[in-house]
């Protein structure tokens, strides 16, 4: 009967600068969770006796747990799970619908910061503690989050890792967007769109790192065996990613229609709305659905491609099948085929 | 971030008024549909009201003509204009918005209608 007692509960705290503090999210069979505060019995208001989740607190390698409650801002790009029993029980959860789910917050307290001695002890044969190995994604100037060059620290070496096109990586993938608390892997990114063409002028962390890594275990487990250090490499790609946790995401409206859930999609990344042309990537209802989804509408009911007769229409295009899967917008400035969607009615 | 903060919530009698206000901060410009929901003592959440940028509105059944949902672009607030309230209109009532496929919740106001 799994619980947050158990030696092996993997657990982690997202959505926050610190891994002591965020969104309760949980490794169950299939992968992440977000746990929402209204699991077992709880109202979603309920704070609870902290000390209950002091087991989470130290195998996170953190400080004792200062609260328990709902987390203030609910974000949930992956699934979530409400779980009944005693509290600190995972053996019988659900998914629950992402929109009806408040996630579950937990702070502990920060470990204590050493600060090292002034005089330098006589050397002993215990080795000193390193930092953990860790990675960063490095984007480029007004770049976005979970988006850019993959660097990989070890103790006090870091750099960046080379990648052939043709390695077989996709669960390395998947555990480095992980890692990074970015989600799953979407896709590879040139090295013009991660940025790794740096300005003379920029600040000296983010010229490039004196150490390349190379991919040493594709199905790694834990960073430190997944790379091996090499000598730089003056040519060559390095591994940059884009994450599914990504901003700014695309947003979408319904405009023109007679209702909150009908109209002619429009789409924005940030800075003005355009309509959203029609795509061949897109002809399945997948892509309508989010955009559903997004109004708070129902399901999608119809789609249908507005004719494109005029040469002087002009929107946006995503080359994916779904909007949230596309980082970049793409202009189109000619022979623009809106798509005008029905969704139902919100009301179950 | 996205941050949605309720309030205006209270005890008030069968046949009174309350307006509700969502004030949302953080990436506020861009969430185009905010929706108030509201959750009974051991019952489902249910949608109450939605209303979009362009101040287009749908209601659920059960709170049409009673209620109506505005919204302040400028001020980046939301209002539930609650009128004729009844017994079971008591709740936890939440703003909810998306930024893409990712949700925000505010904390919730509790309203409890007195008969």
């Known amino acids: 009967r799994l619980s947050w007692y158990d030696p092996d509960f993997q657990a982690r705290l997202t959505r926050s600068n610190s891994k002591c503090q965020g969104q309760l999210e949980v490794y169950l069979k299939d992968g992440w969770h977000m746990v929402c505060s209204q699991s077992w019995g709880r109202s979603s208001k309920q704070w609870e006796d902290p000390s209950q989740a002091s087991k989470v607190c130290q195998r996170l390698n953190c400080g004792v747990p200062l609260s328990l409650g709902p987390f203030l801002v609910t974000y949930t790009p992956q699934s979530s799970i409400i779980c009944y029993g005693q509290l600190g029980s995972f053996s019988n959860c659900s998914h629950s619908r992402n929109d009806m789910c408040h996630s579950l917050g937990l702070t502990c307290l920060e470990p204590q910061k050493t600060t090292p001695p002034t005089t330098r002890p006589p050397p002993t044969t215990t080795p000193e503690p390193t930092a953990p190995p860790r990675l960063q994604l490095v984007a480029q100037s007004g770049g976005q989050h979970c988006a850019g060059v993959v660097e990989f620290y070890s103790g006090s070496l870091g750099g960046t890792i080379s990648y052939e096109a043709q390695d077989k990586t996709q669960d390395l993938e998947n555990f480095l967007c992980n890692n990074l608390q970015c989600g799953s892997f979407l896709k590879h990114l040139p090295e013009t769109e991660a940025g790794r063409a740096q300005d003379p002028g920029e600040p000296r962390e983010h010229q490039p790192l004196p150490i390349q890594w190379k991919i040493q275990n594709s199905s790694c487990t834990s960073l430190e065996h997944c790379f091996r250090k090499i000598k730089p490499q003056k040519s060559g790609r390095v591994l940059a990613l884009l994450c599914s946790g990504f901003q700014p995401k695309v947003q979408s409206r319904l405009v023109g229609g007679s209702s909150i859930c009908e109209g002619t999609v429009e789409v924005r990344q940030g800075a003005q709305w355009a309509a959203l042309c029609d795509s061949s990537s897109a002809r399945s209802s997948l892509r309508w659905e989010e955009v559903c989804r997004e109004q708070q509408c129902g399901s999608v009911n119809s789609y249908r491609v507005l004719d494109a007769g005029d040469p002087t229409s002009r929107g946006l295009f995503c080359p994916h099948q779904k909007l949230s899967q596309c980082h970049e917008l793409w202009e189109r400035n000619s022979y623009c085929k809106k798509v005008f969607v029905t969704c139902q009615d919100p009301n179950p | 971030q996205v941050q949605l903060q309720e309030s205006g919530g209270g005890l008030v009698q069968a046949g009174g008024s309350l307006r509700l206000s969502c004030a949302t901060s953080?990436?506020?410009?861009?969430?185009?549909?905010i929706g108030w929901y509201r959750q009974a003592p051991g019952k489902q959440r249910e949608l109450v009201a939605l209303?979009?940028?362009?101040?287009?509105?749908h209601y659920a059944d059960s709170v049409k003509g009673r209620f109506t949902i505005s919204r302040d672009n400028a001020k980046n607030t939301v209002f539930l204009q609650m009128n004729s309230l009844k017994p079971e209109d008591t709740a936890e009532y939440y703003c909810?918005?998306?930024?893409?496929?990712?949700?925000?919740w505010g904390e919730g106001t509790q309203v409890t209608v007195s008969s």
């Open positions: 209303v979009n940028s362009g101040g287009q509105t």
């Open positions: 953080g990436i506020t410009s861009s969430i185009n549909v």
């Open positions: 909810h918005g998306r930024y893409g496929i990712d949700n925000y």
